[in-house]
């Protein structure tokens, strides 16, 4: 088996790479500033923490997260290392682009990558769907579509919905596993005889998912208080954000090993599982007022993630062509589902007693948000997925899906695993 | 006791650049969100800024937007606003005000608890 | 947008006040009270609708129907003579309304 790209490829990744690097450098060379105001340096370290947390979780969590391929492990972590930092620099710009710049150059603040992480964060969820099946010049472009979309998706919330920063985002959920399920659903599907075991996950790269997974775990929180305004909301998302996923682990580990004839407890179902609750949690964790109703929600997704996770992967496999270990999109859909559900019931409670049908009114604009993510997902999903499919990018023939050889250089092998 | 304390307020010239202060005691801008509202003379109250309690986002109204900076120095525990291109609609009494927020059912409500006696700018040539 | 009426109201010590508020667009119950005598700070009465800064005497209260907020003083004092803004927190910019001046009769 041949360790080198295919020659067009070899042409075409670099090319199409760093020209696309270089026009960002000119981009933010004609039209960004760094911010100038006068601020305090403890305020700046404070404001940077989040952002290191943030690109923690990014970088080595939904890095290792994905590696659990028993021969793709490389190509996940650094692809995904690849598509963090070109998918930061996009998001920097279109997001300054968007809300910025009719005053004129876009003001690049920590803010701004501290959002601009959590928008490439967005892609690393959804290519958990089409990881092994691409290579790095198609993953450029499901960056740059998934971003933008991303981005005027937020824009238009914001300024039809008035939503804050906040209920924006936390739409990422919902947004990436549909938009990962719809790419997924549109590239070639069947895994040639013989090669079956290469998407079947193996004890190292487990291990190293599993990193990725507690990694994710421990800041989740970070990633759920981020764009809050106030203290005391950020201190209630954490509070919550932490009770949902501490939850949610006890519930993976117990839920997996009822689920199992044997009582055995499933790598995959934990990797996904112990985050259920920080995902069902994101839309309301600032508003949840007490620990026991964060808990409860922990302990609902768990079942839900552990449920899907058993039910899911054959109909997920047999349609979308996605492995049994790439269980990411199928989770965040269901679990962002609960999640924005639980807002609305939030949101009904709250205008009972408004009268002039402003219930109904509300629902329904919360309603309106959710399915205009979910549309656009689904059709800048389909749009990527057709975009993947051109010949010009030379997609890895289906025999050598899931396979670092494919990409990488191996100086101790001279053939095969 | 929680106070506010504008300064920086005077007579400038069209075009021309003031910066006010506002002093905060018996609490941290570290964990306070701050506004500054302004009342024209006649007028009723118009926000101008805000900046949160981190310092990570600052909000503008759309008649300042460009030429006034919110920024502060939370190691002098003061509020900044830096005006610049100054005209004279911009003359009028400037409020700093502290933000609060509370937990709603849906979302949480933000409000001004405490607010400073203000300083007055006048832009006239 | 907020509209306030009326935009002035001569009334006698203990008499019952009704402001009134009215948003453009659906604001929730993000909605504020502010109370402004010249050359004072402005002072907050009531926040989120109904709910009573501490300090704040009882006589004071919202509510909400709607788009519609009202702020009623029950029995007017002399202090109470000022004037009072409404104010929305649901989305920047944090708009005013124009104001009510209450004077004496």
């Known amino acids: 088996m041949s360790s080198k790209y295919p020659r067009s490829v070899r042409r075409c990744l670099p090319l199409w790479a760093l020209t696309l690097e270089a026009a960002l450098i000119l981009l933010f060379y004609f039209f960004t500033h760094y911010d100038a105001s006068l601020e305090d340096q403890k305020g700046l370290v404070a404001s940077y923490q989040v952002g290191q947390d943030l690109t923690v979780m990014a970088a080595i969590g939904l890095g290792f997260l994905t590696s659990s391929f028993r021969r793709h492990s490389w190509s996940s972590v650094a692809f995904n290392l690849f598509m963090l930092a070109l998918g930061v620099q996009w998001a920097i710009l279109l997001d300054g682009f968007l809300s910025q710049f009719p005053s004129g150059k876009v003001v690049i603040t920590l803010f701004s990558i501290r959002l601009a992480t959590m928008s490439a964060l967005s892609v690393l969820i959804s290519v958990d769907a089409v990881l092994g099946k691409v290579n790095l010049a198609q993953l450029v472009v499901m960056v740059l579509v998934e971003v933008t979309a991303l981005g005027n998706l937020r824009m238009v919330i914001s300024n039809i919905f008035n939503t804050d920063y906040h209920m924006n985002m936390m739409h990422i959920y919902v947004f990436a596993a549909y938009f990962g399920l719809s790419v997924a659903w549109c590239l070639p599907k069947p895994l040639p005889e013989g090669t079956e075991d290469k998407d079947q996950t193996a004890t190292i790269p487990s291990l190293s998912a599993m990193l990725g997974a507690l990694f994710l775990w421990m800041f989740w929180p970070s990633f759920n208080s981020a764009l809050l305004r106030s203290p005391i909301e950020r201190k209630n998302a954490v509070f919550n954000t932490y009770y949902a996923v501490a939850v949610s682990v006890v519930t993976a580990i117990s839920g997996s090993s009822l689920a199992h004839p044997q009582g055995k407890i499933s790598k995959t179902y934990v990797h996904s599982a112990v985050l259920a609750g920080g995902v069902a949690v994101g839309t309301s964790c600032h508003l949840i007022p007490s620990p026991w109703l964060a808990m409860v929600l922990g302990l609902v997704a768990g079942l839900i993630s552990v449920g899907g996770a058993k039910y899911l992967p054959g109909c997920c496999n047999r349609v979308l062509g996605i492995p049994h270990s790439s269980i990411m999109g199928y989770n965040f859909s269901l679990l962002g589902l609960l999640g924005e559900i639980i807002y609305i019931v939030l949101l009904v409670l709250d205008t009972v007693g408004a009268g002039n049908g402003m219930i109904g009114f509300q629902v329904l604009l919360s309603i309106g948000e959710l399915s205009l993510a979910i549309v656009i997902a689904l059709m800048s999903g389909l749009l990527t997925g057709l975009l993947l499919n051109l010949k010009i990018w030379k997609a890895p023939h289906e025999a050598k899906y899931f396979d670092d050889q494919v990409f990488w250089k191996f100086p101790h092998l001279a053939v095969g695993f | 006791q929680v106070k506010l304390l504008e300064s920086g307020g005077g007579v400038v010239q069209p075009g021309g650049s003031l910066r006010l202060s506002c002093e905060a005691s018996g609490f941290t801008l570290r964990s306070s969100g701050m506004h500054w509202v302004r009342q024209a003379p006649g007028k009723g109250l118009e926000w101008v800024a805000l900046i949160w309690f981190d310092g990570s986002i600052r909000s503008y109204a759309e008649s300042v937007k460009g030429r006034f900076t919110i920024s502060r120095d939370t190691s002098k525990n003061t509020l900044y606003l830096q005006m610049r291109s100054l005209s004279a609609d911009d003359t009028a009494v400037y409020y700093c005000?502290?933000?609060?927020?509370?937990?709603?059912?849906?979302?949480?409500?933000?409000?001004?608890?405490?607010w400073g006696k203000g300083t007055t700018v006048t832009v006239s040539s | 947008v907020l509209t306030q009426s009326p935009s002035s109201l001569s009334a006698s010590i203990r008499d019952r006040v009704t402001i009134t508020c009215r948003a453009s667009q659906n604001i929730g119950s993000y909605l504020n009270w502010y109370q402004h005598k010249p050359g004072t700070a402005p002072k907050l009465l009531i926040y989120?609708?109904?709910a009573l800064q501490s300090g704040v005497p009882s006589r004071f209260s919202g509510s909400r129907s709607g788009t519609d907020f009202t702020l009623t003083i029950s029995s007017l004092q002399p202090e109470d003579f000022a004037t009072y803004y409404c104010?929305?927190?649901?989305?920047?910019?944090?708009?005013f309304g124009q104001g009510t001046n209450l004077q004496i009769k």
């Open positions: 104010q929305q927190s649901y989305s920047p910019p944090y708009t």
């Open positions: 005000a502290r933000d609060k927020a509370v937990r709603g059912i849906s979302r949480y409500n933000y409000y001004m608890d405490v």
């Open positions: 989120a609708v109904s």
